[in-house]
């Protein structure tokens, strides 16, 4: 619409303009959402990228607390593996966050298609093998450039895996490279934090990474609006439920 001014003086409206915004288009969008019976949408994408063998899939299974017996020997991911990670948020609002996790294959033959699936409304984990030293940090740069090109303001967390088999020299070299070349540097995306973990077992390091992922998800804003909990029409949620239930009926080899 072309409306640029929407005076609301003398109208006793119970609005919190801090969350809506004061521009006419923001107010109209909010009123439209109200009309459409809007509900909070506590779902967000978590994209896991990195080179082959860096431990992305194993890391994801540990983060999601998948049972050890379900892990077995890890075969290479084909294309992109998508799954839901439900998280209970223990705050005042007692809400459930669902991270829709996209585990990108690290093999080179998939590189050309991956960028098409990288979106703005997502949190990115860029994973590398810490035990291979600082060359691995360099090898992660093409992924970071792709994120910058497709989702420049999306938060990124760098994750160095194989902490259990890396020594002080390797850790020090990776830290130095990350600090000097990646953090707050032009040409790179918004790297919010970085962690070192052993992805094969539950640990203090893994718990801290999990906490960072949750915090970054809940605090991520696009145009000053929180992504998680954003109001969307109820019919969209219903449509999503129908599509998800239909997906269960699709044969696995499809």
């Amino acid at each position: 619409s072309k409306i640029w001014d929407l005076p609301l003086d003398e109208l006793h409206l119970n609005f919190d303009f801090k969350h809506i915004g004061c521009k006419a288009k923001d107010i109209i969008r909010f009123l439209q959402q109200r009309l459409k019976k809007a509900v909070p949408y506590n779902r967000m994408k978590l994209m896991i990228v990195g080179n082959t063998g860096s431990g992305k899939t194993t890391l994801l299974q540990q983060l999601m607390k998948t049972k050890k017996s379900d892990l077995g020997m890890q075969s290479a991911t084909v294309g992109i593996d998508v799954k839901d990670w439900p998280i209970q948020i223990r705050d005042k609002r007692k809400r459930d966050l669902v991270l829709n996790v996209w585990d990108f294959a690290g093999r080179e033959e998939f590189y050309s298609t991956h960028p098409h699936f990288m979106t703005q409304r997502a949190l990115y984990l860029a994973v590398y093998d810490l035990s291979k030293g600082q060359a691995e940090v360099d090898a992660m740069k093409p992924w970071l450039f792709n994120i910058k090109a497709r989702a420049s303001s999306s938060p990124v967390i760098l994750v160095g895996t194989h902490l259990d088999v890396s020594d002080e020299k390797q850790r020090k070299a990776c830290m130095s490279k990350i600090t000097k070349e990646l953090l707050n540097k032009r040409g790179f995306p918004a790297i919010r934090d970085y962690h070192f973990v052993n992805a094969t077992e539950e640990s203090d390091a893994l718990a801290k990474l999990r906490k960072t992922i949750i915090n970054e998800s809940l605090n991520f804003k696009i145009r000053d609006q929180l992504v998680v909990g954003q109001l969307i029409p109820d019919c969209y949620v219903e449509l999503e439920k129908i599509i998800l239930s239909e997906r269960k009926n699709v044969p696995i080899e499809f």
């Epitope: 902490l163 259990d164 002080e168 850790r171 020090k172 830290m175 130095s176 600090t179 000097k180 934090d193 970085y194 962690h195 070192f196 052993n198 640990s203 203090d204 390091a205 801290k208």
Partner: nanobody, 121 residues
Framework: QVQLVESGGGLVQAGGSLRLSCAAS??????VGWFRQAPRKEREFVAA????????DYTDSVKGRFTISRDNAKNTVYLQMNSLKPEDTAVYYC????????????????WGQGTQVTVSS
């Protein structure tokens, strides 16, 4: 090689306060922690802070009394100790790990020489 130098120790009365400082050489912001060792006792963990200064860990006995913080521009980590008790008497050591967070899974890589804190009753 990272070098850690502690300062700020001394003699204080019970209920008093002290602020310990740990100055680090080098330009990488490591996770830093404080330990203490009382006479004839094991060295024990006190508090730790991550590279950015927004994630902290404390041992139960100091929670609510001690605060760890850092100033990355000065490459210094602080331990503010309030409501001191005689049982806080010990040599306080600063330690660093070549990691962004204080992960209990890995041992510290660097240690300072220590600073004596004595709390009299």
């Amino acid at each position: 090689q990272v070098q850690l130098v502690e300062s700020g120790g001394g003699l204080v009365q019970a209920g008093g306060s002290l602020r310990l400082s740990c100055a680090a050489s080098g330009d990488v912001n490591y996770a830093v922690g404080w330990f203490r060792q009382a006479p004839r006792k094991e060295r024990e963990f006190v508090a730790a802070i991550n590279w950015r200064g927004d994630n902290t860990d404390y041992t139960d006995s100091v929670k609510g009394r001690f605060t760890i913080s850092r100033d990355n521009a000065k490459n210094t980590v602080y331990l503010q100790m309030n409501s001191l008790k005689p049982e806080d008497t010990a040599v306080y050591y600063c330690a660093a790990k070549s990691a962004p967070y204080w992960y209990s899974d890995i041992a510290p890589d660097y240690w300072g020489q220590g600073t004596q804190v004595t709390v009299s009753s």
